[in-house]
């Protein structure tokens, strides 16, 4: 069962698997969650023994719990592995008066801690940083930004130090501007130094492992047809000083590619849902259970907290009701210790790690081609914002971007004096479904960009913080924010959705409408709007001849673009001249330009 509570002045006795340093108990809990075996942890805050400060002891237990003992300054808790909510490694906190130690590999002057953190985020080797503020006692060290890395991505120690701040790279928040290379190159071996090697069933799993590894920048995978038997299914994790492979060698049956650390939110990286036929995963055996088929075996593994992967052996005889043997397994690093083929078994991984991926990457219902009306579950991030005063009506669209957050347009709230009169309905296809007793989310807070004045001048973006959290289902789930590393992506499959007017003088539609609309360059768009400035924080979409566009009532809703099988919230419906007019494209808020703002506001709230 999910236990998010932290226990103060308590430590778990025994079960130690590793001791690391973290700046807070919360961060310790995240480290535990991402560790392949950690189920519980004890964090030492400032106690009597300074050598124990900031230690995070990761623990495992066959019974999933350990004896709790009293200890001043200790904070204990459980990993989020047992929880169904989404888990992110993203940590935007900066820690004042803490020096997080690692290998300093770059030292330079920075204007602020924020600039230092950006430098770290955009440096491929950087895990965390320490910045000496302008009040630091040693004059020459003031405003110095130290970029650091370690073998584990976690500090080797943490010390109290006045007038410094430390923090982590925001790569895992999808905030890096570094290039994101998604190609996997066949018949290619990267010849650079190996930092680690693991067993993997295919190049995609190898890439995921590389992405998850703190120092892996690229990888080479030898398939099961690789001539050297001892190297088959071997996944070599690699790095280099430049961050790029120095040598590529052409070799058959080998595949190479890059870590997705700079585009982590754009495709699933932790979750391996495939089944590997005629394949046996070796590892430490946790349990053997009888199951009807490999899907049931995977489900059992997913529901068994310590299970990391499984092998299913179909039944050879019918006497046990056709049930095969489901071997639940684990290892020290979460990967099989060896992979064998040709024994008729089916293997795979736990799906427990799927929640470590952004929920927005989950595959959704296939698009209905043709027609303008949507079907339920086609745009599960689309919500309708209602205003209840003086009478209840649809006000604007919006998009689910987190389990308590809606992204919408600022201009929707020009006349709204209080969040109390707002209601958010999700999982809705037809406005007529909304009755007096229909479930809605109250709005706790409306956060409007502080530079917003009018839609036409930009910054037309707002966040709604909901009073309760959304449980994701097929009909209500988030859309991915674009990754800053994907700034130059040319989106070709973009759709605008909403319940807005279908022509300028019209009324709100009952069924959610959709229209496929091409993106237009800002130069082209500017030509149609002589009296307005189309800024780089805006993006335009529309047909030259007009005819399809967003219109009144669609405001705040998404301009959704599909890229690499994942939907991204590229724009927020903002303004335009009329609706669907010739050479007057719709103007949208360019979401990628506000990713930092969104993160800042959602984290601080």
């Amino acid at each position: 069962e999910c236990m998010t509570k932290l226990f103060q002045d308590t430590y778990f006795h025994g079960g130690d698997i590793a001791v690391v340093f973290t700046p807070s108990a919360k961060h310790c809990q995240v480290v535990c969650t991402h560790h392949p075996r950690c189920l519980l942890f004890t964090f030492m805050a400032e106690s009597e023994d300074p050598t124990k400060w900031f230690t995070c002891t990761l623990k495992d237990s066959v019974t999933e719990t350990l004896p709790m003992l009293n200890m001043a300054g200790a904070i204990s808790g459980y990993s989020f592995k047992q929880c169904s909510h989404q888990i992110s490694a993203c940590n935007t906190n900066v820690y004042v008066d803490l020096d997080m130690k690692g290998v300093n590999y770059n030292s330079s002057v920075s204007k602020s801690a924020q600039e230092c953190q950006e430098r770290c985020t955009n440096d491929m080797h950087c895990h965390f940083f320490t910045y000496a503020t302008r009040h630091f006692p040693s004059v020459k060290h003031r405003n110095v930004c130290l970029l650091k890395y370690t073998q584990t991505g976690i500090p080797t120690s943490i010390k109290k130090l006045t007038d410094v701040v430390s923090g982590f790279s925001l790569k895992s928040c999808a905030l890096s501007n570094l290039a994101c290379i998604r190609d996997i190159f066949p018949t290619t071996v990267f010849a650079d130094s190996n930092i680690d090697s693991v067993m993997a069933p295919d190049a995609f799993v190898c890439r995921s492992i590389c992405t998850h590894h703190p120092n892996c920048l690229f990888f080479t995978f030898f398939s099961q047809e690789w001539p050297t038997e001892s190297e088959r299914n071997l996944c070599l994790l690699k790095t280099s000083n430049s961050g790029l492979p120095s040598t590529r060698i052409r070799k058959n049956k080998a595949f190479s590619g890059f870590s997705l650390q700079n585009c982590r939110h754009s495709i699933p990286v932790f979750c391996h849902s495939s089944f590997y036929h005629d394949t046996e995963f070796l590892g430490e055996e946790l349990d053997i259970v009888g199951e009807n088929g490999h899907e049931a075996c995977q489900k059992t593994c997913t529901n068994t907290i310590r299970c990391q992967f499984f092998t299913y052996s179909p039944s050879q005889e019918s006497c046990n009701g056709g049930k095969g043997k489901c071997y639940l397994k684990l290892s020290s690093n979460g990967s099989p210790t060896k992979i064998l083929h040709g024994r008729g078994s089916i293997s795979g991984y736990t799906l427990r790690l799927c929640k470590m991926d952004n929920a927005c990457t989950t595959k959704i219902k296939p698009r209905i081609v043709g027609g303008t009306k949507s079907v339920l579950g086609e745009w599960p991030w689309q919500i309708t914002v209602h205003i209840t005063s003086p009478t209840q009506r649809h006000l604007c669209g919006g998009s689910i971007i987190g389990n308590q957050w809606i992204l919408t347009a600022a201009h929707c709230f020009n006349e709204v004096e209080s969040p109390r009169i707002l209601r958010v309905y999700s999982g809705i296809l037809n406005q007529s479904e909304i009755k007096e007793d229909t479930f809605f989310f109250g709005v706790q807070e409306v956060i409007i960009h502080d530079q917003f004045e009018a839609a036409e001048t930009g910054y037309d973006i707002a966040l709604l913080k909901l009073e309760t959290t959304i449980n994701y289902t097929d009909s209500q789930r988030p859309i991915c924010l674009p990754s800053k590393g994907d700034r130059n992506v040319m989106y070709t499959d973009c759709w605008v959705t909403g319940w807005g007017y279908t022509k300028l003088r019209d009324k709100i539609q009952n069924t959610l409408q959709k229209a496929k609309i091409p993106l237009v360059t800002n130069e082209e768009c500017q030509a149609g709007y002589r009296s307005h400035k189309i800024t780089n924080k805006m993006i335009c979409a529309g047909y030259k001849e007009g005819g399809k566009d967003a219109c009144k009532g669609d405001s705040g809703g998404p301009l959704s673009c599909k890229h690499n099988e994942v939907w991204h919230l590229v724009g927020i419906t903002s303004w335009g001249e009329g609706c669907a007019q010739r050479e007057r494209p719709g103007v949208y808020t360019r979401v990628v330009e506000y990713v930092d703002w969104i993160l800042e506001k959602t984290q601080e709230a």
Epitope: S107, K140, L146
Partner: antibody, heavy 116, light 107 residues
């Protein structure tokens, strides 16, 4: 682990130049400053100068005109050059790593004797 | 340039004693003072930095205090292995400078 090792000529004639190399391992010179400190026989420590991670340098005011510190990041080496040596430059020369102005790791030192 | 003065060149002590070494800066150095221990034939070893922060692995009998121009280094209970020369150093402003050193010897 962190190590610093000085290597120098040992004996130099007066008015000649000195070149000492500090070779480091276990850390990167782009991320840390390196100091040079000397200690004449039976005397105290004297700060000579330093080179920062980003290549900036600072020198002891009294020796500035005779000193030059440089480095080669790729070879993990820092160089101390000093000209117009006199007998009172006889000392043990240490390199040390910077930790916010203090020196957390020191080499074993190399002894220089200035004598004809 | 900043001059650091350790008024006592020698201090006598016995095992178990509490001893304090003082260091004075010629101008305000905030809290940017470090203390080093040097034993015969060895390199100096960092004990305290930024006035009061103990370096990793340094026993807690060694402490530092002060700010501005006056600084004190204290050994709460002297051990035989603590007999050595102790130097203060300002790391407030370059050129950094050391005090002349205080030799702690057996009474």
């Amino acid at each position: 682990q962190v190590q610093l090792e000085e290597s120098g000529p040992g004996l130099v004639a007066p008015s000649q130049s000195l070149s000492i190399t500090c070779t480091v391992s276990g850390f990167s010179l782009t991320g840390y400053g390196i100091y040079w400190v000397r200690q004449p026989p039976g005397k105290g420590l004297e700060w000579l100068g330093m080179i920062w991670g980003d290549g900036r340098t600072d020198y002891n005011s009294a020796l500035k005109s005779r000193l030059s510190i440089s480095k080669d990041n790729s070879k993990s080496q820092v160089f101390l050059k000093m000209n117009s040596l006199q007998t009172d430059d006889t000392a043990r020369y240490y390199c040390a790593r910077d930790y916010y102005g203090s020196k957390d790791y020191w080499g074993q030192g190399t002894t220089l004797t200035v004598s004809s | 340039d900043i001059v650091m003065t350790q008024s006592h060149k020698f201090m006598s002590t016995s095992v178990g004693d509490r001893v304090s070494i003082t260091c004075k800066a010629s101008q305000d150095v905030s809290t940017a003072v470090a203390w080093y221990q040097q034993k015969p034939g060895q390199s100096p070893k960092l004990l305290i930095y930024l006035t009061s922060y103990r370096n990793t692995g340094v026993p807690d009998r060694f402490t530092g205090s002060g700010s501005g121009t006056d600084f004190t280094f204290t050994i709460s209970s002297v051990q035989a292995e603590d007999l050595a020369v102790y130097y203060c150093q300002q790391h407030y402003k370059t050129p950094y400078s050391f005090g002349g050193g205080t030799k702690l010897e057996r009474l």
